[in-house]
Interface confidence: low
């Protein structure tokens, strides 16, 4: 037999587990007595569709409860096991009040409020985590989830989904628990180019060879579908067609926060008066997107030694 | 002449597969990011895939992702979309094109038809 | 994705007439807009890079103009060979994305 769990005086509604795609009728019987629940709503227990409503429950309401399903060719019996609590006294909710654990690799995650579908709910869901009410803009609910955005280990815990069901003209509280633990796992993010700086100039002598690096970031571990490329006067490099400059391939690198990078370098042999005149994009593609950062260069004043 | 040359196309039943090819000459393919864009019959133009210079960045429309892979040899100066598990609506001409200026498709091929049908 | 409008869808035009193509972008793309033209059974060619660049080649009848979301392509005068189908392409962001096109008719 399935299980299900509700907290004393808050609402319980629970599907009768045979159900599957069934759209036949579904008695309801207490399994020790084979007494039938009624489809009244002036009971606090009662049938409605295939589910069985507690307004509100009751910690004697716990025990064995028998759906069936009556079909023209077949009955289809099933248990379901109702156990109704009290409410901890402490903030400490119980493994046996716990609905699934939640992992998220993702730098954004979002959890989903648990049996919240069975319910006739209205936003806004208030969400708690080990008992606290969520206020940061970090954390944002919508509809059934809890957005959780830049997410870090500091995340990790119980978190609780509060909301109300309404009945006849009465309003229930109905909550529910789980964990969210967040996995050690790379992301992909929309690439960072972190050198050189947007619209940065940058100082060359004219007939000496010039560098510039570009290195941008795509999040943690791999880096797959992901380059960094320059183009002059918005053409690729090797549409060009200047023998003097050149594209280094790129090459991987860590930066101090751990985020996988890449850097091309842009080579050229000898700076002439026309480079000055070019606009360098450095660009940093992946499947998130496209960045792009202009460099210009600048004739290097020489220094007055007056 | 830059040019571009498809090949490969023709007539393949559904869940198929064809590998398509683009030979490239008068130009640095190299270092050229390389494109494939498609046209269905009667419709407007699609992006299907991309690739960097050195192949290490490939890119791909959702529609084809996972059926699709672009692939080039340098040494050889051409381009390949191999495809899988082909639709009913991947039936459209294709399209090889160089990547030149801000993005834009600077370079066309003259384009090779697929048809999947049974 | 960036979605890309173009008006008219299509457009009936005499030799000589000035005709205008636009092009909206459903977020600022800045200045990475492209402008193709398609004649039937050929493929596209390029006219117009970073909005308002004229490919080297093409007619300097054709302009183009417009930065962040509105775009416009611009033909002075018609011309008998003008007549086909035009598309704008974004490639502010990967996925790079067409316009649906417009289809340049004899009156």
């Known amino acids: 037999s399935k299980s299900s769990w509700g907290l004393e005086n808050e609402a319980l509604i629970v599907r009768c587990p045979q159900r599957g795609r069934s759209t036949y009728p579904v008695e309801w019987y207490y399994s020790d007595t084979n007494e039938s629940i009624p489809t009244q709503k002036r009971n606090r227990i009662f049938v409605s569709r295939d589910r069985l409503k507690f307004l509100p429950a009751r910690v004697e309401d716990s025990g064995i409860y028998a759906c069936v399903i009556r079909s023209p060719n077949l009955n289809k019996t099933g248990y379901l096991n109702v156990t109704i609590h009290k409410k901890p006294p402490s903030c400490n909710i119980p493994d046996y009040l716990m609905y699934s654990t939640v992992r998220g690799s993702d730098k954004n995650f979002k959890i989903t409020c648990p049996t919240i579908d069975l319910y006739n709910w209205t936003a806004p869901v208030q969400w708690f985590k080990n008992c606290k009410a969520l206020q940061e803009p970090r954390f944002r609910a919508h509809r059934s989830y809890l957005f959780i955005d830049n997410v870090t280990h500091d995340d990790e815990g119980d978190y609780t989904c509060q909301f109300t069901h309404a009945e006849n003209g009465t309003n229930y509280i109905v909550t529910a628990t789980r964990s969210f633990t967040v996995e050690e796992k790379g992301f992909s993010m929309f690439p960072v180019i972190t050198n050189p700086p947007y619209n940065h100039t940058m100082e060359v002598e004219i007939g000496k060879p010039a560098s510039i690096a570009c290195s941008a970031c795509f999040g943690k571990g791999s880096h797959f579908l992901a380059d960094v490329l320059w183009q002059i006067n918005k053409t690729v490099v090797g549409n060009f067609g200047e023998a003097r400059i050149q594209e280094e391939e790129g090459r991987n690198e860590s930066s101090s926060n751990d985020m996988d990078c890449l850097t091309s370098v842009l080579r050229i042999t000898g700076v002439t008066e026309k480079d000055l005149s070019l606009e360098y994009d450095c660009l940093a593609l992946n499947l998130h997107g496209m960045i792009r950062h202009t460099i210009r260069l600048r004739r290097k004043q020489p220094i007055d030694h007056r | 002449e830059v040019q571009l040359l498809e090949s490969g196309g023709g007539l393949v039943q559904p869940g198929g597969s064809l590998r398509l090819s683009c030979a490239a000459s008068?130009?640095?393919?190299?270092?050229?990011?390389m494109s494939w864009v498609r046209q269905a019959p009667g419709k407007g133009l699609e992006w299907v895939s991309a690739i960097s210079g050195n192949g290490a960045g490939t890119y791909y429309a959702d529609s084809v992702k996972g059926r699709f892979t672009i692939s080039r040899d340098n040494s050889k100066n051409t381009l390949y979309l191999q495809m899988n598990s082909l639709r009913a609506e991947d039936t459209a001409v294709y399209y090889c094109?160089?990547?030149?200026?801000?993005?834009?498709?600077?370079?066309w091929g003259q384009g090779t038809t697929v048809t999947v049908s049974s | 994705d960036i979605q890309m409008t173009q008006s008219p869808s299509s457009l009936s035009a005499s030799v000589g007439d000035r005709v205008t193509i636009t092009c909206r972008a459903s977020?600022?793309?800045?200045?990475?807009l492209n402008w193709y033209q398609q004649k039937p059974g050929k493929a596209p060619k390029l006219l117009i890079y970073?909005?308002?660049s004229l490919r080297s080649g093409v007619p300097s009848r054709f302009s183009g103009s417009g930065s962040g979301t509105d775009f416009t392509l611009t033909i002075s005068s018609l011309q008998p060979e003008d007549f086909a189908t035009y598309y704008c392409?974004?490639?502010?962001?990967?996925?790079?994305?067409f316009g649906q096109g417009t289809k340049v008719e004899i009156k």
């Open positions: 977020q600022s793309i800045s200045s990475y």
């Open positions: 008068d130009f640095n393919f190299k270092n050229a990011w």
């Open positions: 392409q974004q490639s502010y962001s990967t996925p790079p994305t």
């Open positions: 970073d909005a308002s």
């Open positions: 094109a160089r990547v030149g200026e801000t993005g834009a498709f600077d370079i």
